[in-house]
C-alpha cells in the first residue's frame, strides 16, 4: 500500500512544479545544484535556477512543449554541464558530462565532497545582517540555502527548507527587536548546532543506503519506527518503512523534488492514519507542512501496548520457526525486529540490529541441523553479552564524563582515538573526538532507560563522519576495516581497537607547537580546538605517553596561554615562553 503517485506524467518537471509550488521548487533546485557544484559562485547558481524555473513554467503551460518530457536528471544534468568553468574548477568531474543518464547522475553523486575546500562561514555583525535581510530578503535566504547546501552536500533537502523558514523567522523577529544581538545570536547558534546535527544524521542514512544497500536501511527503519510506534501493527510499520526508504533513497540520490514531494505525501498519510500509528502525533499533525514533517520525524516514542506476549513463543518455541524463516526470510526477520524493538525503547537501534543479525545467523545454522529446535532453543541467551557490552561502556563513559566535564572528557577521547588510529589527520581526529565527547552532555543526563538509544545511536552518527572523511583520503587500514565490515558493528569495532603498535611516531616539529598572540582573541571554543590540536600532535609524537605526562604538559600549556594573554607584550611572551614550554614538554615526554 504505497502512498506515492504511480501515474505517469507527460512532463515530470511540470508535475513537480505544480505539486511543490514555485517557491519550494526554486529552493530545492538551488539546493540540488549547490550540492552538486559546491565551488560555483552563488550568482551562477541563481542564474541556472532561474533558467530551469522559466523552463518549468513553459512546461506547466504546455506539457507537450519541447523537452518537457525529459527526465529531471536529464534536464538538471544538461543545465549543470553548461557551466563554462567546469573543467578548471572541478577537474575530472567534468568527465561526467560525457556520460548519458543514469550514469551521468551517478558520476555527479560520486564527486560530492564531504569536506569541500571552502572558507569557514564567518558571521557578520548583526546590523550588517539585518540590513542585508531588509534590503533583499529573497537573496538573503537563497544565500543561506546555497551556503549550507554546498558545505553539506547530503543535507536532507526538505528539512533544509524548514531550517530556512526558521532562519527567516529569526531575522523577521529580531531585526525589529530593541536588542537585536541578544534576540538573534542565540537563535542562530541553535540553528547552526541543530543544522550540523541534522546534516550528520542524514549523512548516516545516505551512507547506509549507498554503502550497505536498501536492506540495511530498511532494517534500521523497522527498528526505529517500531520503537517509536509500538502500537502500530507490523503491516503498518512495513508500509511506513517502504515509503520512508523511497523518500531517503531519492534525497540521497539527488532527486530532491521527488523526495520533498514524497515526504509531504508521507506526512499526509501518517496524519490521516494517526489512529493506527501513534497517539503522539496529534500536535505534529496540526502544524503547517514543513513543521509537520520535522515534528513527525522527531516525535517521542508512543507508550508500549500493555501485556505484550513473550517473544519466545513465536521465535523460539514455535514448531514453524524454520518453515517461516525458509519461506519468508526477510518478512520473518522483519517481524522479529519489529517485535523486539517495540518492546525495547531502551535499546539503541544498532543493538537491536545486532540482535536481529545474531538471530538470523543462528537460524541459518540451526535450520540446516539435524534437530533445529534443540540447536536454536538457547538463541536468546546469546543476546545477553551483546546487550551488556554497550550498557557497561555507557556506564563507564558517563562516570568519566561526570568526573571530568565535557572539555576534559573530549581530551580523554582525543588521546584514546589518536592512539587507536594515529594516521588519521589531526583536524579529523579533533573534529570527531570533540563530537564523540559531546555524547556526555547530550546523553548522560538521561535516565538509564534513555541512555543507550541516545548514546549509541549518536555515536553511530559521529563515527560515520569519521568514515566519510576517511574515505576521501584513506590512511588507515583499521579505520577502513571498521567502517566497511558492518554498519551496526562500527562502534564496537572502534571500541575494541587498542593502541596501534605498528605506528612510527611523527617527527617532532617545533612549528606545530608555536603559538601567537592571535590565540588570545579567539572564542573559548576556538581556543579549545587549538589546545586539542596540540594534544593530538603530542600523542602523534609520543604515542606511548602516559595520561599523567600528557596532563602535565597540557596544564603547562594552559598556564602558558593564560600568562601570555595577560602580558603587556603578548607576542614577545609567546615567543620566549613558548620556546621554554616546548623544551620543558620535550623533556617531560622524553622527546
Amino acid at each position: 500500500r504505497g502512498v506515492f503517485r504511480r501515474d505517469a506524467h507527460k512532463s515530470e518537471v511540470a508535475h513537480r512544479f505544480k505539486d511543490l509550488g514555485e517557491e519550494n521548487f526554486k529552493a530545492l533546485v538551488l539546493i540540488a545544484f549547490a550540492q552538486y557544484l559546491q565551488q560555483c559562485p552563488f550568482e551562477d547558481h541563481v542564474k541556472l535556477v532561474n533558467e530551469v524555473t522559466e523552463f518549468a513554467k513553459t512546461c506547466v503551460a504546455d506539457e507537450s512543449a519541447e523537452n518537457c518530457d525529459k527526465s529531471l536528471h536529464t534536464l538538471f544534468g544538461d543545465k549543470l554541464c553548461t557551466v563554462a568553468t567546469l573543467r578548471e574548477t572541478y577537474g575530472e568531474m567534468a568527465d561526467c558530462c560525457a556520460k548519458q543518464e543514469p550514469e551521468r547522475n551517478e558520476c555527479f553523486l560520486q564527486h560530492k565532497d564531504d569536506n569541500p575546500n571552502l572558507p569557514r562561514l564567518v558571521r557578520p555583525e548583526v546590523d550588517v545582517m539585518c540590513t542585508a535581510f531588509h534590503d533583499n530578503e529573497e537573496t538573503f535566504l537563497k544565500k543561506y540555502l546555497y551556503e549550507i547546501a554546498r558545505r553539506h552536500p547530503y543535507f536532507y533537502a526538505p528539512e533544509l527548507l524548514f531550517f530556512a523558514k526558521r532562519y527567516k523567522a529569526a531575522f523577521t523577529e529580531c531585526c525589529q527587536a530593541a536588542d537585536k544581538a541578544a534576540c538573534l545570536l542565540p537563535k542562530l547558534d541553535e540553528l547552526r548546532d541543530e543544522g550540523k546535527a541534522s546534516s550528520a544524521k542524514q549523512r548516516l542514512k545516505c551512507a547506509s543506503l549507498q554503502k550497505f544497500g536498501e536492506r540495511a536501511f530498511k532494517a534500521w527503519a523497522v527498528a526505529r519506527l517500531s520503537q517509536r510506534f509500538p502500537k502500530a501493527e507490523f503491516a503498518e510499520v512495513s508500509k511506513l518503512v517502504t515509503d520512508l526508504t523511497k523518500v531517503h533513497t531519492e534525497c540521497c540520490h539527488g532527486d530532491l523534488l521527488e523526495c520533498a514531494d514524497d515526504r509531504a505525501d508521507l506526512a499526509k498519510y501518517i496524519c490521516e492514519n494517526q489512529d493506527s500509528i501513534s497517539s503522539k502525533l496529534k500536535e505534529c499533525c496540526e502544524k503547517p507542512l514543513l513543521e509537520k514533517s520535522h515534528c513527525i520525524a522527531e516525535v517521542e516514542n508512543d507508550e508500549m501496548p500493555a501485556d505484550l506476549p513473550s517473544l519466545a513463543a513465536d521465535f523460539v518455541e514455535s514448531k514453524d520457526v524454520c518453515k517461516n524463516y525458509a519461506e519468508a526470510k526477510d518478512v520473518f526477520l522483519g517481524m522479529f525486529l519489529y517485535e523486539y524493538a517495540r518492546r525495547h525503547p531502551d535499546y539503541s537501534v544498532v543493538l537491536l540490529l545486532r540482535l536481529a543479525k545474531t538471530y538470523e545467523t543462528t537460524l541459518e545454522k540451526c535450520c540446516a541441523a539435524a534437530d533445529p529446535h534443540e540447536c536454536y532453543a538457547k538463541v536468546f541467551d546469546e543476546f545477553k553479552p551483546l546487550v551488556e557490552e554497550p550498557q557497561n561502556l555507557i556506564k563507564q563513559n558517563c562516570e568519566l564524563f561526570e568526573q571530568l566535564g565535557e572539555y576534559k572528557f573530549q581530551n580523554a577521547l582525543l588521546v584514546r582515538y589518536t592512539k587507536k588510529v594515529p594516521q588519521v589527520s589531526t583536524p579529523t581526529l579533533v573534529e570527531v573526538s570533540r563530537n564523540l565527547g559531546k555524547v556526555g552532555s547530550k546523553c548522560c543526563k538521561h535516565p538509564e532507560a534513555k541512555r543507550m538509544p541516545c548514546a549509541e545511536d549518536y555515536l553511530s552518527v559521529v563515527l560515520n563522519q569519521l568514515c566519510v572523511l576517511h574515505e576521501k583520503t584513506p590512511v588507515s587500514d583499521r579505520v577502513t576495516k571498521c567502517c566497511t565490515e558492518s554498519l551496526v558493528n562500527r562502534r564496537p569495532c572502534f571500541s575494541a581497537l587498542e593502541v596501534d603498535e605498528t605506528y612510527v611516531p611523527k617527527e617532532f616539529n617545533a612549528e606545530t607547537f608555536t603559538f601567537h598572540a592571535d590565540i588570545c582573541t579567539l572564542s573559548e571554543k576556538e581556543r579549545q580546538i587549538k589546545k586539542q590540536t596540540a594534544l593530538v600532535e603530542l600523542v602523534k609524537h609520543k604515542p606511548k605517553a602516559t595520561k599523567e605526562q600528557l596532563k602535565a604538559v597540557m596544564d603547562d600549556f594552559a598556564a602558558f596561554v593564560e600568562k601570555c594573554c595577560k602580558a603587556d607584550d603578548k607576542e614577545t611572551c609567546f615567543a620566549e615562553e613558548g620556546k621554554k614550554l616546548v623544551a620543558a614538554s620535550q623533556a617531560a615526554l622524553g622527546l
Partner: nanobody, 126 residues
Framework: EVQLLESGGGLVQPGGSLRLSCAAS????????VAWFRQAPGKEREFVAG????????YYADSVKGRFTISRDNSKNTLYLQMNSLRPEDTAVYYC???????????????????WGQGTLVTVSS
C-alpha cells in the same frame, strides 16, 4: 475490533468433503495471520491449519496434511477450509481465529490468537 462468522459445517459421511467459510468484518485480514482450530468433545482446542498474511505461507497439523486446504479471498475478506477425505476423528467444532498485526503464523498456540468466531460443528459419521 474483528468479528468472525463461520459457516459450512454439517453432517457428512466418512470419505466425504465439506468447505468451511469464515467471513471477517471490522477490519481486513489480508495482512494478518488467520487460522482454523477445532475442539472435539472433552478435548483441548487444537490447531488445524493457518495461512500467513502478506506472505501466503500455509501451515497444517500433521493429522490433516494432504487432506485439508486453507485459502482466503481477500476481496471478500473471507477465509476457507476445504476438507476432503473426512474421518470420524475430524468430528469437532471448528473455529477461525485471527492474530492482528502478524503476517505469519508463528505459533500454533491458541492462546496467542486475539479474535475468535463462535464456531461451526462438523460431524463425520455414517
Amino acid at each position: 475490533e474483528v468479528q468472525l462468522l463461520e459457516s459450512g459445517g454439517g453432517l457428512v459421511q466418512p470419505g466425504g468433503s465439506l468447505r468451511l467459510s469464515c467471513a471477517a468484518s471490522g477490519r481486513t485480514v489480508s495482512s494478518t495471520a488467520v487460522a482454523w482450530f477445532r475442539q472435539a468433545p472433552g478435548k483441548e482446542r487444537e490447531f488445524v491449519a493457518g495461512i500467513g498474511g502478506s506472505v501466503d505461507i500455509t501451515y497444517y497439523a500433521d493429522s490433516v496434511k494432504g487432506r485439508f486446504t486453507i485459502s482466503r479471498d481477500n476481496s471478500k475478506n473471507t477465509l476457507y477450509l476445504q476438507m476432503n477425505s473426512l474421518r470420524p476423528e475430524d468430528t469437532a467444532v471448528y473455529y477461525c481465529a485471527v492474530r492482528p498485526g502478524r503476517p505469519l503464523i508463528t505459533s500454533r498456540d491458541a492462546n496467542l490468537y486475539d479474535y475468535w468466531g463462535q464456531g461451526t460443528l462438523v460431524t463425520v459419521s455414517s
